[in-house]
Amino acid sequence: YSHWPSCCPSKGQDTSEELLRWSTVPVPPLEPARPNRHPESCRASEDGPLNSRAISPWRYELDRDLNRLPQDLYHARCLCPHCVSLQTGSHMDPRGNSELLYHNQTVFYRRPCHGEKGTHKGYCLERRLYRVSLACVCVRPRVMG
Amino acid sequence: YSHWPSCCPSKGQDTSEELLRWSTVPVPPLEPARPNRHPESCRASEDGPLNSRAISPWRYELDRDLNRLPQDLYHARCLCPHCVSLQTGSHMDPRGNSELLYHNQTVFYRRPCHGEKGTHKGYCLERRLYRVSLACVCVRPRVMG
């Protein structure tokens, strides 16, 4: 595991900075992927992980940034514009939309932090919100009032 | 506002510990809630947020722990055992299951950290994985081989 240097603030340092010495491993989604005969196809499998059995199936796309914590994030990408029929598992049903569920996740970006006299004092972590897509969900289309 | 003290390790300290001085705010999911006439009922709305328009609708339950970071997490709770019909939005279709999508989220627990001679040196953050349910997904039931 690689470590980011720890950073301890001198008294005058901005208290909004988040400071961390870090040892991290990527945390992929919980359920391990199983082989999927048509990994990118718009169909709902009868076995395999949840994202391939869903009638709004999706794949995960890795987003890696070594200056961000967590370094590895996964974005869901819908494989169908509409939901797949529960009956056949392959034909699309235009009465349902496959929509991404988003979440604003807290992440940290490392940047140099400086001591009292402007000297480089390791790295500090800057807190940001980062938009990730968690899954695809089969929804009824909005009816505008 | 007061802050947890930062904690910098002495040389011999275990490098698997994550150490942080932190200022955070709860980060709720992205889409604001809209009114839902039957907030706890098993139906798919034609308006409102994604979790109420889904044919596997869910609600969010707050999980707050003041010694954890983030302090506020939200767990999805499915409102139906099966998926709701796309046609009616209310009748359940036994051909589809409403299943929770889980994720192992990185969280931090605070605990006292100690200096070289066992003296109390503020708080350290211990990294853990914490299982959260993100959403409910309409899936085809597994066919056992």
């Epitope: - | 705010v25 999911p29 604001p32 809630a33 839902n36 907030p39 947020p49 609600r59 707050l62």
Partner: antibody
Framework: EVQLVESGAEVKKPGASVKVSCKAS????????MNWVRQAPGQRLEWMGL????????SYNQNFKGRVTLTVDTSASTAYLELNSLRSEDTGVYYC???????????????WGQGTLVTVS | DIQMTQSPSSLSASVGDRVTITCSAS??????LNWYQQKPGKVPKLLIY???SLHSGVPSRFSGSGSGTDFTLTISSLQPEDVATYYC?????????FGQGTKLEIK
């Protein structure tokens, strides 16, 4: 100026339901959780639950045995408390209260509605 | 649930007196304690948060202290407008719980 304005007094029969509203103004409604607190005559304050308007996320006091439902209408900046299967001991003043917070240290009810008197008899 | 117990339940003091109200938690709550003031016929108001931090607009004669299970609200010099019932509240765990209140009157 932050304001929480609750609906008017209600008189209900035992077994009925009541729905109290709380209209917020003067701040970003979705940015703060809303608590509901009850005060029966001569009794201590009793926390009923809270709701995050951003996602409808809730936490309830289990002592109310599932009789409480909290909802919001973000477009109207309004929170709702519904209490069903009313009994005489539910008589009291019901308050909504905005919850402020700071990193790690506090969650506190900094603004309160004027209260809604619910009488069950 | 965490039980919060205040003492005394009521007290009478003179203007200018130093007044102390205590609050005891049935288990340790670190410093996760708030104090509220409710004047007769009025809505509760936040007085002190996180054991000792004064809410904005609250006079400096009010102070709070404590940690773990035992907490204190102190009014250094009682004023006539301080007539009220005072409640402590823990927020380390759901459900939030309040003390039974301390009714403060002027002699």
């Amino acid at each position: 100026e932050v304001q929480l304005v609750e609906s008017g007094a209600e008189v209900k029969k035992p077994g009925a339901s009541v729905k109290v509203s709380c209209k917020a103004s003067g701040y970003s409604f979705s940015g703060y959780t809303m608590n509901w607190v009850r005060q029966a005559p001569g009794q201590r304050l009793e926390w009923m639950g809270l709701i995050n308007p951003y996602n409808g996320g809730t936490s309830y006091n289990q002592n109310f045995k599932g009789r409480v439902t909290l909802t919001v209408d973000t477009s109207a900046s309004t929170a709702y408390l519904e209490l069903n299967s009313l009994r005489s001991e539910d008589t009291g003043v019901y308050y909504c209260a905005r919850e402020d917070y700071d990193s790690w240290t506090f969650f506190a009810m900094d603004y309160w509605g004027q209260g809604t008197l619910v009488t069950v008899s | 649930d965490i039980q919060m117990t205040q003492s005394p339940s009521s007290l009478s003091a003179s203007v200018g007196d130093r007044v102390t109200i205590t609050c005891s938690a049935s288990q340790g709550i670190n410093e996760y304690l708030n104090w509220y003031q409710q004047k007769p016929g009025k809505v509760p108001k936040l007085l002190i948060y996180y054991t000792s931090s004064l809410h904005s607009g609250v006079p400096s004669r009010f102070s709070g202290s404590g940690s773990g299970t035992d907490f204190t609200l102190t009014i250094s010099s009682l004023q006539p407008e301080d007539v009220a019932t005072y409640y402590c509240q823990q927020y380390i765990n759901f459900p939030y719980t309040f003390g039974q209140g301390t009714k403060l009157e002027i002699k």
